[in-house]
């Protein structure tokens, strides 16, 4: 079943840089995606989130699998070159966690890097995972265009991770040089759409809140996503299954720092993907051990 | 609009050290990388490598390994550009352009003078 | 690396009439994608570069169209229909298929 923690997420503030821990399992779909690209001299590695949606299958945003050695067009990461590790709660201890190389990376075939929409992406791992307390799929919404409703708060894990200078091994076993050891979690109000759209017509740039992306936040700041925290789900609790459904995926924000006034984070509407996720897939809804809420 | 605005002129000595930054807006600035581009007087342009701005890896043309290094201050969405020991071979005009590969906008330039 | 030749060195040209530069690379610029990472660049006298084409033959927008790129492999082609005086600069090409990315040494495009 899908987006059943073990444990019950509580309801408490908290900010995903420097704020307080998650306890082990409330996130059992989050996912650490580490790319580590040694297609081309030098190598070059970075870091992202993703969401679990069934033993084989991680939902992530585009531009965390795209290859920035090129800018001119959209070129995906070779599989090759791509590591999950799930039930992961502490970087510094990888004893429980779940590590998996990717068999597929599939982009949104849309994906715009001047604009971020279509920031979707999949990644289908080579072995199906084991799912557990620490291991569990998180749900996908229903088709609706409209997205989560204005004001309706949602939750985002992650780890912040960001900085480049280190190994895979040390990033996870030691995890000394990332951002945040254990994973972070904030709870983030829906921002009516117009409001996000103002927001950002209003700076000078090229910036574009789509149909495609909602946005979340506070007007005063304070409390937001970060580098780092890419791809990772915005997750809401559905009212009539009581199941957690990811309705967004961490996506893009600024110009300002993460966190200022009147800033909101950017978020992938993954409603409008529903179907292009099943079909990515390759199973009608309710075969796999993830599914959509009902 | 689209902009990358360079630091001012430099005039410094040999052996001493130069730090020249790159103000980028108007566009998500972990979507593309930053190129750095080096410019002699009355030459062409020589390409001296980019860094990623999402990872914040750099990479570097051989002939600028070793004395030169790439940063970010990615909140402040500002790329940097350093070169330790400075020679008088250093002197030019070094520009910064949005993009790895594809180095569509340029700043302005930044004049680096070594003299003693 | 790959070297990048550009012929000629300076280009005369009376307003309305066209021009040519052409661009040889010491290897084909095909990349294993699929793609030609063959881009054109215009320096004004005391400016900073601005790209004008890119993948071969993609306007940049609010480039003219009286500018096209044209070529494949190894030779390419930039072409003015008619040059106008704010046309006037240095013409670069470059390659950002082999690392590390090469530009060839400059056309200077003079008006008669």
């Known amino acids: 079943e899908c987006g059943q923690p073990s444990r019950s997420l509580p309801s408490l503030v908290k900010r995903i840089i420097g704020g307080r821990n998650a306890e082990p399992g409330l996130f059992p779909w989050q996912a650490l995606i580490v790319v580590e690209d040694t297609s081309r001299v030098p190598n070059d590695k970075w870091f992202g989130s993703g969401a679990l949606l069934s033993e084989s299958w991680i939902l992530t945003a585009a531009h965390v699998l795209r290859s920035q050695r090129r800018d001119t067009t959209v070129i995906p990461v070779s599989k090759e070159h791509v590591t999950v590790y799930l039930g992961l709660h502490d970087v510094r201890d990888k004893s429980g966690a779940v590590n998996s190389s990717a068999a597929r990376v599939v982009l949104h075939p849309d994906f715009n890097i001047q604009n971020y929409n279509h920031d979707i992406a999949l990644v289908q791992l080579q072995e199906p995972v084991p799912l557990g307390p620490h291991v569990m799929p998180v749900c996908l919404p229903r088709l609706e265009p409209e997205g989560p409703s204005p004001h309706m708060l949602g939750l985002v894990a992650g780890w912040g991770i960001s900085n480049p200078n280190v190994t895979v091994d040390e990033i996870i076993s030691s995890g000394t040089r990332t951002l945040s050891d254990v994973l972070q979690y904030v709870k983030l109000p829906v921002v009516p759409h117009a409001e996000c759209k103002t927001s950002y017509e209003s700076r000078s740039g090229n910036y574009s809140v789509t149909e495609n992306m909602f946005c979340a936040g506070y007007y005063e700041g304070g409390k937001d996503t970060c580098l780092g925290d890419s791809g990772g789900a915005f997750v809401i609790l559905d009212d009539l299954s009581q199941r957690w459904v990811v309705q967004g995926l961490v996506s893009w924000g600024g110009p300002e720092e993460c966190g200022s006034k009147q800033v909101y984070g950017v978020y992938t509407k993954v409603s409008n993907y529903v179907d292009w996720v099943w079909e990515q897939m390759g199973s009608p809804q309710g075969r796999a051990p993830g599914g959509t809420v009902s | 609009q689209i902009q990358l605005v360079q630091s001012g002129p430099e005039l410094k000595k040999p052996g001493e050290t130069v730090k020249i930054s790159c103000k980028a807006s108007?566009?998500?600035?972990?979507?593309?990388?930053m190129s750095w581009v080096r410019q002699a007087p009355g030459k062409g342009l020589k390409w001296m490598g980019w860094?990623?701005?999402?990872?914040?890896?750099?990479t570097y043309a051989d002939d600028f390994k070793g004395r030169f290094a790439f940063s970010l201050e990615t909140s402040a969405r500002t790329p940097y550009l350093q070169i330790n020991n400075l020679k008088n071979e250093d002197t030019a005009t070094y520009f910064c352009?949005?993009?790895?590969?594809?180095?569509?906008?340029w700043g302005q330039g930044t004049s680096v003078t070594v003299s003693s | 690396d790959v070297l990048m030749t550009q012929t000629p060195l300076t280009l005369s040209v009376t307003i309305g009439q066209p021009a040519s530069i052409s661009c040889k690379s010491s290897?084909?610029?095909?990349?294993?994608?699929?793609?030609?990472?063959l881009n054109w660049l215009l320096q004004r006298p005391g400016q900073s570069p601005k790209r004008l084409i890119y993948?071969?033959?993609k306007l940049d927008s609010g480039v003219p169209d009286r500018f096209t790129g044209s070529g494949s492999g190894t030779d390419f082609t930039l072409k003015i229909s008619r040059v106008e005086a704010e046309d006037l600069g240095v013409y670069y090409c470059?390659?950002?298929?082999?690392?590390?990315?090469?530009f060839g040494g400059g056309t200077k495009l003079e008006i008669k």
């Open positions: 470059w390659q950002g298929t082999h690392f590390p990315w090469t």
């Open positions: 993948l071969v033959s």
């Open positions: 860094i990623n701005t999402y990872s914040g890896v750099p």
């Open positions: 290897q084909s610029l095909l990349d294993s994608d699929g793609k030609t990472y």
């Open positions: 108007g566009y998500i600035f972990t979507s593309y990388g």
């Open positions: 352009a949005r993009g790895g590969e594809a180095m569509d906008y």
